[in-house]
Interface confidence: low
């Protein structure tokens, strides 16, 4: 099966790489604009230069193109805890990230929030914190894992999943209570 091409891709495929077909005259192939620039005017004729202009501050193009406008620079979302790793330039968008000892949680493909890496108190680090994944903790005896924190088995209620992990401790507590009532 041949993938469906949009009109623009069809038109571009007629011209050699690095060129695009003139929108008003399909016998002319114009040279695409370099990254960091945008198309101001199409080339007037074969072998003549395309009029490309540099992107203004606050905008960019990251690859060769024939866009009529540069793309607006992304802004790091402070409300998501993001920090700017590198500023926007005419040929590269802003790069956003998280602070040290934080990881990214992606809400959607393009939106992430920064969270603090778990420290594994009362446990050990099974897998270190990664750029896009929290630390994976293993808890010490007498503690169970709840929402990636090691919680004392004294907080384990019988109805919870922790009963399997905390069974000896729970039985001991029960035994103590029983002996106190006799």
């Amino acid at each position: 099966l041949v993938p469906h091409l949009g009109d623009r891709e069809k038109r571009d495929s007629v011209c050699p790489q690095g060129k695009y077909i003139h929108p008003q005259n399909n016998s002319i192939c114009c040279t695409k604009c370099h990254k960091g620039t945008y198309l101001y005017n199409d080339c007037p004729g074969p072998g003549q230069d395309t009029d490309c202009r540099e992107c203004e501050s606050g905008s960019f193009t990251a690859s060769e193109n024939h866009l009529r406008h540069c793309l607006s620079c992304s802004k790091c979302r402070k409300e998501m805890g993001q920090v700017e790793i590198s500023s926007c330039t005419v040929d590269r968008d802003t790069v956003c990230g998280c602070r040290k000892n934080q990881y990214r949680h992606y809400w959607s493909e393009n939106l992430f929030q920064c969270f603090n890496c778990s420290l594994c108190l009362n446990g050990t680090v099974h897998l270190s914190c990664q750029e896009k994944q929290n630390t994976v903790c293993t808890c010490h005896a007498g503690f169970f894992l709840r929402e990636n924190e090691c919680v004392s088995c004294s907080n384990c209620k019988k109805s919870l999943e922790c009963t399997k992990l905390c069974l000896p401790q729970i039985e001991n507590v029960k035994g103590t209570e029983d002996s106190g009532t006799t």
């Epitope: 998501m80 805890g81 809400w107 959607s108 969270f115 929290n134 929402e147």
Partner: nanobody, 124 residues
């Protein structure tokens, strides 16, 4: 037992304002991320806004950005949604929702508890 009780809904004219409240109980409120979700008549659920446990981080759906403000008072265990410049398309039942995890939500719909909802009708 976890309980979320919304209030503040009602009938308002286009361009008007309303403030929704959600009283929370049965869990350690300041620790959990919270959200507002809505359901317009005959439509599916639409996520509106979220706020982190510390109240510092917020996020809004594009449809309400600049008009709605989410906030919380952790000392009162209450979540708020200030709705300004209301439009007919904001007509919906608004639900307060608690995220299942306090570490990081798995998605925008990773809720374990919902309120019963409060109806907001925007009409002239």
């Amino acid at each position: 037992e976890v309980q979320l009780l919304e209030s503040g809904g009602g009938l308002v004219q286009p361009g008007g304002s309303l403030r929704l409240s959600c009283a929370a109980s049965g869990f350690t409120f300041p620790v959990y991320n919270m959200a507002w979700v809505r359901q317009a008549p005959g439509k599916g659920l639409e996520w509106v806004s979220f706020i982190a446990g510390n109240g510092q981080q917020t996020y809004y759906a594009d449809s309400v950005k600049g008009r709605f403000t989410i906030s919380r008072d952790n000392s009162k265990n209450t979540l708020y949604l200030q709705m300004n410049s209301l439009r007919a398309e904001d007509t919906a039942v608004y639900y307060c929702a608690k995220f299942a995890s306090k570490v990081s939500p798995m998605s925008l719909t990773d809720f374990d508890y919902w309120g019963q909802g409060t109806l907001v009708t925007v009409s002239s």
